[in-house]
């Protein structure tokens, strides 16, 4: 059987603080525990939770927490419940609340001589003791004039009267804590000799030079006097009226009436009551100069046909507040319908293109009208004026392809070739009526390319397949200057493309025919074995039927290749002492040689002293010094062909003889000596 | 001996009405956890609801407001009421205490 | 309303196989361990195998075992034997006396 160790018990609990009810439960086999409160299940919030197997309450709520808890446990094996005795919570707690004015029903309904009394809306449990404050002041229950009913929380004023003014406050205290009224009540139960408002003065704005009239009166018994004063304090009676109010008249009811209002009349009028007793009541109203300002402008409009659209009107600055509405064609806009005004917005419902054309927005106040018109275009998809059409385009001419449409605004038109937009630069551009152009055609623009005209109702696009139509020309040109090399094999050779394939062939520049070793194949001319009378002007010749003929000149020179005679050593030399570096090349035509040293070529007019290029090639440097270390490169070159070889100076320090040397020992290493 | 034994069963109309009787023997409804269970032909097991060892009940969220699970102690019986019939609760309905004891089961057929 | 997912909801296996079903709930089950494992032959009630997530029921061979925890299971049989084929469901027990069923696996020989 299930058996409680530690059962739930009814306690106190304070709200808001924390509480626990215990229970622990034995049992054969396992089992699970929850809670119940008035018989149905607790969940698990932050606030309460189950701890083990008893309920954990983090703050005790007065609402949430009334009633009856139970435990129960289950073993959902066997099926087997037991509950715990019931246990409840009683919550101390004590809440704020306001005074108010429980008799007579209204605050207009308190007269002098009559019961007033006000009730302290402070609860809790148990039920506080209450005080009662007037002006700050504790009110003791023995006082006269009022009763203190602590069970009804209520204070009796009877009979109230001018003396019980002021504002009355309560608190409350019980075991659980204090709380003082969250409103306070003011009493206000007039002298009869006091002044008090009957009509008080509003603000007023009017238009230059319109009139203005503020209303004042009081009552009290004797009759008050009352005045008026404008803002410097200067008092305005129909017998002295300041300069700048000679148009001011104050009638017998108080009320003052300014005629033709002027700027320096705008400001604060003060309407002063004064009983035979009391202070003073002074009420204020400003007088205000309407004003409007301008509006500021609209950006004109792109709106889609069948979409909903607004456009808002913001009002000029003004006084008073500008009304704002909307017209269109001379007729002011209905607040409702397909096209309407709805507050400041201008609202098109399921848009026309009849819609299109200016709105405008009006505001006006006292002090005048402004208005600002908006322009509204509708926007309709393209329609095609003249779609791409599929061209052949000559290589190398300007190429046009069309993409005229009409549309309202004007569409965009963008290109795109092979479905990569095509960004204007030198070759390609588009003409504001959507034309591309291109520039200078070229084989590979023979692709599709697609225009898109555009607006923002929507878009159409066509496309177009451009053939290029191909010039006939060498591909590549052949260079006009070759070398071949004597007495071995040479290819010169030619090619070149057209609409049609074209045919090429060889010739001599004088017409004579082509030595029999000398082969002619497919545009690729072959010497078999070059000989001093091969060279001289050839020409290559391409053809086809449609295009024609095209001729290439090539003029050929037959030439001994460089090869180096003589080739510059590596080379160590003392420093201060002179560098011999030796360099001779043969061919035909005889090659120039220049040296290269430490990467930049020396300029035989620029070497100084020090440097010299002989005529045979070979480079003399004296004086040498370590920063002339390096490698030195021997170029020789002739309208062929160029070659190059090359090798290391070394410039040493000369060693110091030791005397177990003699003087004639050789040095370690191969020098040049001066 | 404990045992459980479901009762009531039979073919029912759609839109008919049916009372299921789980008697049990050997032990006191008033201690114990009932639950009614319900397999439809072929069909997995769907719990129908549970009736506490002090009266309260509580239902799968499908079954309230047509099924309803009431006891009487005197007779050591615990009923399913089940109203407003359809085709789909046609099933074997078993009665359990708790998760180990359980009753043979009793058919329900609902057919026009 | 509770889901509870049974997976695989077939699963054929051999004689000395391990075998692992999972049953995945759509919130957390009371306690974090309140669920359940039944095995159920054909024409038959079902049999309690494990109470609360890993305790086994009187006269369940050892090799069923449950773990788990929030709304993860498992059963695991650790050497399946031919008196293991049948179907398996999980049965969970909620916050406010809710109960569910996972649809069940049907474990056939292979």
């Known amino acids: 059987a299930i058996v409680f160790i530690k059962q739930p018990s009814s306690q106190d609990a304070l709200q808001g603080r924390r509480a626990l009810l215990r229970c622990e439960v034995e049992a054969p086999g396992p089992v699970h525990v929850y809670w119940l409160l008035d018989g149905a299940p607790v969940q698990d919030t932050e606030r309460r939770f189950a701890q083990g197997s008893s309920l954990s309450f983090a703050a005790v709520d007065r609402l949430q927490d009334s009633g009856t808890f139970q435990c129960v446990a289950r073993d959902d094996v066997t099926g087997e419940e037991a509950r715990s005795a019931n246990a409840s919570f009683n919550i101390k707690w004590i809440e704020a609340g306001p005074v108010v004015l429980k008799h007579p029903a209204s605050e207009a309904e308190i007269q002098p001589q009559t019961q007033v009394t006000l009730r302290c809306h402070i609860d809790g449990h148990p039920r506080p003791t209450y005080q009662w404050f007037r002006d700050g002041t504790p009110l003791s229950d023995g006082q006269s004039n009022h009763t203190v009913s602590s069970k009804e929380r209520n204070l009796t004023l009877r009979p109230a009267g001018p003396e019980h003014s002021g504002l009355y406050s309560c608190c409350a205290h019980s075991a659980f804590g204090q709380a003082c009224s969250s409103q306070n009540f003011t009493l206000s139960i007039a002298d009869e000799s006091f002044a008090r408002v009957v009509l008080a003065p509003q603000d007023v704005v009017v238009a230059r030079y319109e009139e203005a009239m503020f209303h004042c009166q009081f009552s009290a018994q004797p009759p008050p006097s009352l005045q008026w004063l404008f803002e410097d304090e200067t008092p305005i009676t129909n017998r002295s009226r300041p300069p700048h109010l000679r148009r001011a008249t104050v009638f017998a009811n108080g009320s003052l009436l300014l005629t033709q209002v002027r700027p320096r009349n705008a400001g604060i009028y003060r309407c002063i009551g004064q009983g035979q007793r009391g202070p003073p009541i002074i009420l204020e109203a400003t007088l205000h100069l309407a004003e409007i300002e301008d509006m500021p402008l609209f950006e004109p409009r792109v709106f889609t046909a069948g979409s909903e659209e607004r456009v808002t009107c913001l009002p000029p600055k003004g006084l008073p507040e500008p009304s704002v509405w909307w017209e269109h064609a001379g007729v002011r806009l209905p607040t409702h319908g397909r096209v309407y005004q709805k507050g400041h917005e201008l609202v098109l419902a399921n848009i026309a293109e009849s819609d299109a054309g200016v709105y405008t927005c009006h505001a006006a106040n006292l002090a005048g009208q402004r208005r600002q018109d908006v322009n509204i275009t509708v926007a309709t998809v393209p329609s095609w004026l003249k779609k791409p059409q599929d061209s052949q385009l000559e290589e190398g001419k300007p190429g046009y392809l069309d993409c005229l449409t009409q549309a309202t605004p004007k569409p965009t038109v963008v290109w795109y070739r092979n479905q990569m937009l095509i960004s204007e630069d030198s070759r390609f551009e588009v003409f504001k009526n959507g034309t591309l152009r291109i520039n200078s055609v070229e084989v590979y623009d023979g692709t599709w390319y697609r225009c898109m005209s555009s607006t923002p109702a929507g878009s159409i696009e066509a496309q177009a397949r451009v053939q290029v139509l191909e010039k006939l020309k060498f591909t590549p040109p052949p260079q006009p200057q070759q070398c071949m090399e004597f007495d071995k094999e040479a290819t010169v050779p030619c090619s070149a493309t057209g609409r049609e394939k074209p045919t090429i062939k060889w010739e001599r520049a004088d017409g004579s025919s082509l030595p029999e070793w000398v082969t002619d194949n497919a545009g690729t001319l072959h010497f078999a074995r070059v000989t001093r009378d091969d060279a001289g002007n050839y020409t290559c010749i391409a053809s086809n039927g449609p295009q024609g003929q095209i001729r290439a000149h090539v003029q050929l020179t037959v030439a001994v290749f460089i090869t180096f005679k003589v080739e510059p050593e590596r080379t160590t030399v003392y420093q201060g002492h002179t560098a011999l570096l030796q360099c001779e090349a043969q061919g035909d035509p005889k090659p120039l040689i220049q040296w290269k040293g430490k990467d930049r070529i020396l300029d035989p007019t620029k070497l100084g002293p020090r440097m010299h290029i002989f005529q045979n090639g070979s480079l003399v440097i004296h004086d040498v010094a370590p920063e002339d270390s390096g490698r030195y490169t021997c170029i020789a070159g002739n309208s062929c062909n160029i070659k190059h070889t090359e090798a290391p100076l070394y410039v040493v320090d000369k060693p110091v003889p030791e005397e177990s040397e003699g003087p004639g020992s050789p040095p370690p290493y191969k020098m040049i000596q001066t | 001996e404990v045992q459980l034994v479901e009762s009531g069963g039979g073919l029912v109309q759609p839109g008919g009405s049916l009372r299921l009787s789980c008697t049990a023997s050997?032990?006191?409804?008033?201690?114990?956890?009932m639950n009614w269970v319900r397999q439809a032909p072929g069909k997995g097991l769907e719990w129908v609801g549970i009736?506490?060892?002090?009266?309260?009940?509580y239902y799968a969220s499908w079954a309230k407001g047509r099924f309803t699970i009431s006891r009487d102690t005197s007779k050591n019986t615990v009923y399913l009421q089940m109203n407003s019939l359809r085709a789909e609760d046609t099933a074997v309905y078993f009665c359990a205490r708790g998760l180990y004891l359980w009753g043979q089961g009793t058919l329900v057929t609902v057919s026009s | 309303e509770i889901v509870m997912t049974q997976s695989p909801s077939t699963l054929s296996a051999s004689v000395g196989d391990r075998v692992i079903i999972t049953c995945q709930s759509s919130?957390?089950?009371?306690?974090?361990?309140?669920l359940a494992w039944y095995q159920q032959k054909p024409g038959k009630a079902p049999k309690l195998l494990i109470y609360y997530t890993s305790n086994l029921a009187s006269g369940v061979p050892s090799r069923f075992s449950g773990s788990g925890s929030g709304a993860e299971f498992t059963l695991t049989i650790s050497s399946l034997q031919p008196d293991d084929f049948a179907t398996y469901y999980c049965h969970g027990g909620y916050n406010g006396n809710i109960y569910a069923f996972g649809q069940g696996t049907k474990l056939t020989v292979l």
């Open positions: 009736i506490d060892s002090s009266g309260s009940t």
């Open positions: 919130q957390s089950v009371y306690n974090n361990n309140l």
């Open positions: 050997g032990f006191s409804l008033s201690n114990y956890v």
